[in-house]
C-alpha cells in the first residue's frame, strides 16, 4: 500500500485529543526498510485540534551523524531544529511555534510532534538523517483538515439553502432529491471555504429535502421539511 | 422535548363519522408538519396525510382523498382528522405524528362494528 | 408513489447473533428514510433517522447505512428485547411510504 494513502491511526491520549502518527513500530521497519526509504514523500491529512506526530526514516539511531528537521510553513521563514549526535546538543533556526517540538530528547527519539495541530501547520515537514552511509530523507506534506459546520435552513417556498462554513478543502454538497441548485464557495484568509447550495424544487410531491455534505473528515446529511407553496391548500397524491 | 397527546378510543357504527384530536407541545405548533398514519390490527402502516398548521395546506394519500378531512386549531396546538362514512376496514390504530416523521402520539383506536 | 420494499418479512434469530435487514426504493429514485422498531400495542419508536443517524438513548448496536436507493438496519448482537417489528419509512416524497415490515422473533 503506498505511503499517500495509509489511514490514519487514530487514538485517544490522557486529554482525550486524538493522536495521528505515520510512525512504524520496529517489526515493520525491518520489513519495509527498502520501500519506505525509496518512497521519501508523503502526503498527510490530518485533522485540526488533533495530535501529529512525523517520523523520521527507520534508521538505527546508532548509526546516525545528525538528524535535522526542516519545516516549511506558508508565510513564514523555513524553520530548523537539529541534533548533532556526536557533541549531543541541538539547535534551532527560526523556530518560533511551541507546539512543533521534539518528542522526548533526540538521542532517544528522532520523531516530531505537533501538539494541537492548526490551520497555521500547513506546510512541508522533512527529516534529514546523515550517517555513514549516507543521507536519507522522509517529507511531510501536511495537509490539516478543518471539519465544516453544516447548516440547513428554508429562506422562501420550496427553497432550501445548505451551507458548509469554513471547512478545509472545500466540501462538497449534494442533495436528495436533485433540485435547481446554485452553489457558491467563499474563501477565507486562513485558507478555511465556506460552500453555500440554494436549491429550489418545482415538484410538488417533494416532501422532505436532504443536504448531505462530503468532506476529507467525515460525511454529514441533514434534511428538512418543506413548506408549502402559498395558498395552495389541498392535494391528493 | 415534543409531546403529542392523541385522544381516546372510539367505537363507531359503520356510516358514522368520528373526529380524532393531537394536541401538540414542546416545538413550534405552526412551523412543523402534521401527518397522520393508519395501522390496521395485525398490519403495517399506511400514511393518511398531512397538514401545515402555519396555513392549512393539506396532501391526502388518494385512497383517503374524499373521506379524511385533517383541519387544526393553532390557538389550542391541536389537530384533528375526521373519518367519514365509517366502514368495518377503518378499525385501526391512528397515531399523528410531527418532526418530520420523529415525534408519535401514542395512537387512538377506532373500532367499527356494528 | 414510491414503493418501500423490504426484506426479510420474518426471521427467526438466537440471542447474540447478527441482523440485517434492507429497505429497497422503487423507479431507482433516491429517497432518505427512518428505521422504526415497534413492540405490540406500542407506537413505533424511531430508532435510525435520517438512513444513519443513532436516535439518543437508542444502544448502540443498532445501526442504519446506505444511501440513494438501497439501505440497510442492522443489529449488531440481538438481544432478548429487541423481539418485535421493524419498519422503514421514506419520507422524501409525497404520499409518504413505509416497507411492509419485518417481524423478528428470537430463537
Known amino acids: 500500500q503506498p505511503n499517500n494513502s495509509l489511514m490514519l491511526q487514530t487514538s485517544k491520549e490522557n486529554h482525550a485529543l486524538a493522536s495521528s502518527s505515520l510512525c512504524m513500530d520496529e517489526k515493520q521497519i525491518t520489513q519495509n526498510y527498502s520501500k519506505v526509504l525509496a518512497e521519501v514523500n508523503t502526503s498527510w491529512p490530518v485533522k485540526m485540534a488533533t495530535n501529529a506526530v512525523l517520523c523520521c526514516p527507520p534508521i538505527a539511531l546508532r548509526n546516525l551523524i545528525i538528524i535535522t528537521w526542516e519545516i516549511i510553513l506558508r508565510g513564514q521563514p523555513s524553520c530548523t531544529k537539529a541534533y548533532k549526535k556526536e557533541t549531543n546538543e541541538t539547535k534551532e533556526t527560526n523556530c518560533t511555534d511551541e507546539r512543533i517540538t521534539w518528542v522526548s530528547r533526540p538521542d532517544q527519539n528522532s520523531d516530531l510532534q505537533i501538539r494541537t495541530v492548526a490551520i497555521t501547520h500547513d506546510g512541508y515537514y522533512r527529516c534529514i538523517m546523515v550517517t555513514p552511509d549516507g543521507n536519507f530523507h522522509r517529507g511531510y506534506h501536511l495537509q490539516v483538515l478543518v471539519t465544516p459546520e453544516v447548516t440547513l435552513f428554508q429562506n422562501r417556498n420550496r427553497t432550501a439553502v445548505c451551507k458548509a462554513v469554513a471547512g478545509k478543502p472545500a466540501a462538497h454538497i449534494s442533495w436528495i432529491p436533485e433540485g435547481d441548485c446554485a452553489t457558491k464557495q467563499e474563501y477565507w484568509s486562513n485558507g478555511t471555504v465556506t460552500v453555500k447550495s440554494t436549491c429550489h424544487w418545482e415538484v410538488h410531491n417533494v416532501s422532505t429535502v436532504t443536504c448531505h455534505v462530503s468532506h476529507l473528515t467525515g460525511n454529514k446529511s441533514l434534511y428538512i421539511e418543506l413548506l408549502p407553496v402559498p395558498g395552495a391548500k389541498k392535494s391528493a397524491k | 422535548q415534543v409531546q403529542l397527546v392523541q385522544s381516546g378510543a372510539e367505537v363507531k357504527k359503520p356510516g358514522a363519522s368520528v373526529k380524532l384530536s393531537c394536541k401538540a407541545s414542546?416545538?413550534?405548533?405552526?412551523?412543523?408538519?402534521m401527518h397522520w398514519v393508519k395501522q390496521a390490527p395485525g398490519q403495517g402502516l399506511e400514511w393518511i396525510g398531512n397538514?401545515?398548521?402555519?396555513?392549512?395546506?393539506?396532501n391526502y394519500d388518494e385512497k383517503f382523498q374524499g373521506r379524511a378531512t385533517l383541519t387544526v386549531d393553532t390557538s389550542t396546538r391541536t389537530a384533528y382528522m375526521e373519518l367519514s362514512s365509517l366502514r368495518s376496514e377503518d378499525t385501526a390504530v391512528y397515531y399523528c405524528?410531527?418532526?418530520?416523521?420523529?415525534?408519535w402520539g401514542r395512537g387512538t383506536l377506532v373500532t367499527v362494528s356494528s | 408513489d414510491i414503493q418501500m420494499t423490504q426484506s426479510p418479512s420474518s426471521l427467526s434469530v438466537s440471542v447474540g447473533d447478527r441482523v440485517t435487514i434492507t429497505c429497497q426504493a422503487s423507479?431507482?429514485?433516491?429517497?432518505?428514510l427512518h428505521w422504526f422498531q415497534q413492540k405490540p400495542g406500542k407506537a413505533p419508536k424511531l430508532l435510525i433517522s435520517?438512513?444513519?443517524n443513532l436516535e439518543d438513548g437508542v444502544p448502540s448496536r443498532f445501526s442504519g447505512s446506505g444511501s440513494g436507493t438501497e439501505f440497510t438496519f442492522t443489529i449488531s448482537s440481538l438481544q432478548p428485547e429487541d423481539a418485535a417489528t421493524y419498519y422503514c419509512?421514506?419520507?422524501?416524497?409525497?404520499?409518504?411510504?413505509f416497507g411492509q415490515g419485518t417481524k423478528l422473533e428470537i430463537k
Open positions: 435520517g438512513a444513519s
Open positions: 397538514i401545515y398548521p402555519g396555513s392549512g395546506s393539506i
Open positions: 423507479q431507482g429514485t433516491p429517497i432518505n
Open positions: 405524528l410531527t418532526m418530520t416523521g420523529t415525534s
Open positions: 414542546g416545538h413550534t405548533f405552526t412551523s412543523y408538519w
Open positions: 419509512l421514506q419520507f422524501t416524497y409525497i404520499p409518504w411510504t
